[in-house]
Structure formats: C-alpha cells, structure tokens
C-alpha cells in the first residue's frame, strides 16, 4: 500500500521494481484495478529525489510528465519524468515544460492567450490506468463546462486553483484533485524541501493564507528533523 509515502513532508524513494536490479530507477506496477503502487511496499524517506510512480501527468510536478521510463515500455510502468524544453521532441502537450506546448512533435513556445484549451479543460481521474489509451498514456476525461462557470466548492474536483471558489485552492486529496480551504493561522502546513515537490504528494495541503508563512512551530525546534511540525504563522 501507499501508506508510508503519504507523509506530505517527505520526498519519496521507490524500491526497485519487481525483478529489477537495486540500481534501476524505481517504477510502478499495476497492483489493483485502477491503482498504481510500487513493486514493493516499503518506502523510505530520503533527501535526494527519486522517481515517483504515476498514472496521469497531473500526478507529477509542474516540470514533469508521466510516462514509461523506457521506449515502448509497458503502459503500467510509468514514472514522473523531467519535462522537455523548447525545440525538443514531444508527443503531447504535457511533455513540454511550462510556457510551451507540443506542435507537430516539437515543444514550442505558447503565447499567454493562445493556448488555454486542451490541457486546462481536462482533468484526470486519479489512479486511472484501467482506461489507458493505445499509446500507453492514460485517458483523460473532459470536465463538464458547467464546472468552469461555477467555481468549485470545497471537495469538488478541480484542475487548477482558479477552478475553485475564493478561499480555496486546488490540491490532491488521495483519489483526485479537489478544492480545499487555504490554510489559516496555526494550521499545519507543508514545507517543501525542493522546488516542485508539491506535485509529488498524494495528499497535498493548500498554501498559507495572506499574511502567513509556513514555519517551524516554536515548541518543535528541539524535535528531530523528520518530526518537525510546520504551521502557518504571521510574517
């Protein structure tokens, strides 16, 4: 199970895949209908980044996309890979780094207003590798346009924070990305150790509200690194 990877204050280290060598990049195997989980069930918390299993592009960080680490690899074995820079080859928009999109197999720059459609109007259904397309990339489901006219309420599925009503942000909540409340003073928050790690969590918290920052709680300064509690505090 994914229990021990759910600590949202940790970077994750995958075990080798089933039958794989210890030095091989970690990968995911399909363990149950619609759910991806690692080849073994032991995760360790480490400071250096390791590959993260995924079923959808949206489960990866903003500078990553979800694909098989080997060409022509099994569709069930997918991890988050670094996005492709401008002029690099691509197969779909999500492969290109932010500010670019895939045109005629090449990542090209997108001007701000021109390209809002395909990526933003779709959302994935988490763990959905039971609906993979022929090219091995998970099927996307288009959200009803109704959702884009009405701002999402707490708990409703979303693609980005602008889909959510005021005071809410769009964050992963195990099974999907949903609108959650922006954190208030004193609430537990997540301090990210590396840029982009927010996209790697299966449970995400929103950011701290205006005038607040995520800092170590004073009475937790003596605690060990792994158990330090961060809360939203006044600047």
């Amino acid at each position: 199970t994914l229990n021990s990877v759910l600590n949202s204050n940790a970077i994750k280290n995958l075990p080798p895949p089933l039958g794989g060598a210890a030095g091989h990049p970690g990968s995911a195997v399909s363990a149950a209908p619609g759910i991806l989980y690692p080849g073994g069930n032991k995760y360790q918390t480490i400071d250096n980044y390791q590959p993260y299993p995924c079923a959808e592009d949206e489960e990866c960080g903003t500078d990553e996309y979800c694909a098989s680490p080997t060409r022509g690899g099994d569709a069930g074995v997918q991890i988050c890979l670094a996005c492709r820079k401008r002029r690099k080859r691509c197969m779909r928009h999500a492969m290109c780094c932010p500010g670019n999109y895939c045109k005629n197999g090449i990542c090209v720059s997108s001007d701000q207003n021109h390209f809002r459609g395909e990526i933003e109007e779709t959302i994935t259904e988490s763990f959905g590798n039971d609906h993979s397309t022929l090219d091995g990339y998970s099927r996307r489901t288009t959200l009803s346009s109704k959702m884009y006219h009405t701002k999402g309420q707490e708990g409703s599925v979303c693609l980005r924070s602008s889909d959510c009503a005021s005071g809410l942000c769009c964050a992963r909540h195990f099974w999907s990305k949903i609108c959650k409340p922006v954190l208030k003073e004193g609430q537990v928050c997540t301090k990210h150790r590396r840029k982009g790690s927010h996209g790697l969590e299966i449970f995400q918290r929103c950011y701290c509200g205006e005038g607040l920052s995520c800092r170590i709680q004073k009475d937790h300064h003596q605690a060990s690194n792994s158990s330090r509690l961060h809360t939203c505090q006044r600047h």
């Epitope: 600590n7 299966i202 449970f203």
Partner: antibody
Framework: QVQLVESGGGLVQPGGSLRLSCAAS????????MSWVRQAPGKGLEWVSG????????HYADSVKGRFTISRDNSKNTLYLQMNSLRAEDTAVYYC?????????WGQGTLVTVSS | DIALTQPASVSGSPGQSITISCTGT?????????VSWYQQHPGKAPKLMIH???NRPSGVSNRFSGSKSGNTASLTISGLQAEDEADYYC??????????FGGGTKLTVL
C-alpha cells in the same frame, strides 16, 4: 443544502440480489467522487466502494469485490450499489457518502438484512 | 492490513475535557499526518468532525480539536456537553482500501 437519501434496502435471502440507490441534491453531483459505507448492527463503520465523478474509476473493499457493483447516473444525480450473491455478513445499514474532503456528507442509511 | 485501535469507551462529566486516542501502525497514522474523526449519534449518520488531523469543517464547534503524536492521533473535546454523547471513529486512508476506520469509541457524558 447537501442532501443524500438512500433507498432500496430490505430483507433478502442469502445468495439473493438487491440494488440500492442514493439520490443526491444541493451540490454539483458530477463534480464529486462518491462512496458507500456500511455498518453492521452494533458494529463499526466499513468502507464498501467508491466511484469517481464520471464513473470511469471504481474501487471496492476486498470483502465485496466481485459481488457488488457501484455505478452512478449524473443526469439523475443518483448513485447505485448493485449487490449480488448476498451473505449473512452483508447485513448492515448502508450509507452513501460524498467524497469531498473525506466523507463530508452522509445519507441517513438504508437497512439491508440478509437472512433465510 | 491497516488496523486503527481506539478505546471501546470513555466517559466524562459536563464541563470536563476528554481525549479519545487512535493508535495505528507506523505505516498508517504514524507514517503520515492525515487522520479524520467522525461523530455518530445512535440511529444517525456519521458526521465529519476533524480532517487532516486538526482541521474542523465549517459548523463544527471549536470545542473539538485533533492532534497527532507518533503513531497516535487524538480527538479532544473540551467543555463536555450532554449532546457530545455519541460514538466517535477515527479514519485514515489506504491506497487499496481507501477509507480505513478505527473500531469506534463510545463517549458517555456522566
């Protein structure tokens, strides 16, 4: 306000079938995952099944896998649970619940009794 | 399988504070910060009281608070009132069984 109303419970013999329904109102049904949770008489809560907002992803507890099927009709704002090959141990109050931030709204439940 | 252990019963007098514990293995409650609490009055549906360990949904009294230390999550009810008498369930999440509940704790207000 959010409202969930279950129906379809009743007395059924072991091996029999039953279909539960849950009518949802007061929120955009098609924007939420939904679940069924059950509670045997005098016992604790047990998650049974969950379904994604469009219905293309479904998940089940091991105890009901292969016997129960969860589905939804977003045009009718209704969640369903088709229960086949029922056993005595399936006797419980069945709740439908919205998967917002966790199980944030629940119906009042419908009693399913499996007995000969 | 994940198991969350709760005391079968706790009791307290009106105005007092009580704490209900929920202990899990290191791979569930202790392995991450996510625990929720539900209240269930006899013959009624459960109600979400706490999510993400310590956050109250709107409409829930601030007399209810949650915390976590190591492998144990706790629900504290301060200024105990007669209407708090109910069953309380902790819940965590598992990738295969989604929602996992503790066995429940019966709170009696003396």
């Amino acid at each position: 306000q959010v409202q969930l109303v279950e129906s379809g419970g009743g007395l059924v013999q072991p091996g029999g079938s039953l279909r539960l329904s849950c009518a949802a109102s007061g929120f955009t049904f098609s924007s939420y995952w939904m679940s069924w949770v059950r509670q045997a008489p005098g016992k604790g809560l047990e998650w049974v099944s969950g379904i994604s907002y469009s219905g293309s992803n479904t998940h089940y507890a091991d105890s009901v896998k292969g016997r129960f099927t969860i589905s939804r009709d977003n045009s009718k704002n209704t969640l369903y649970l088709q229960m086949n090959s029922l056993r005595a141990e399936d006797t419980a109050v069945y709740y439908c619940a919205r998967m917002g931030i966790d199980l944030d709204y629940w119906g009042q439940g419908t009693l399913v009794t499996v007995s000969s | 399988d994940i198991a969350l252990t709760q005391p079968a019963s706790v009791s307290g007098s009106p105005g007092q504070s009580i704490t209900i514990s929920c202990t899990g293995t290191s791979s569930d409650v202790g392995g991450f910060n996510y625990v929720s609490w539900y209240q269930q009055h006899p013959g009624k549906a459960p109600k979400l009281m706490i999510h993400d360990g310590s956050n109250r949904p709107s409409g829930v009294s601030n007399r209810f608070s949650g915390s976590k230390s190591g492998n144990t999550a706790s629900l504290t009810i301060s200024g105990l009132q007669a209407e708090d008498e109910a069953d309380y369930y902790c819940q965590t999440w598992d990738s295969l069984s989604f929602f996992v509940f503790g066995g429940g704790t019966k709170l009696t207000v003396l």
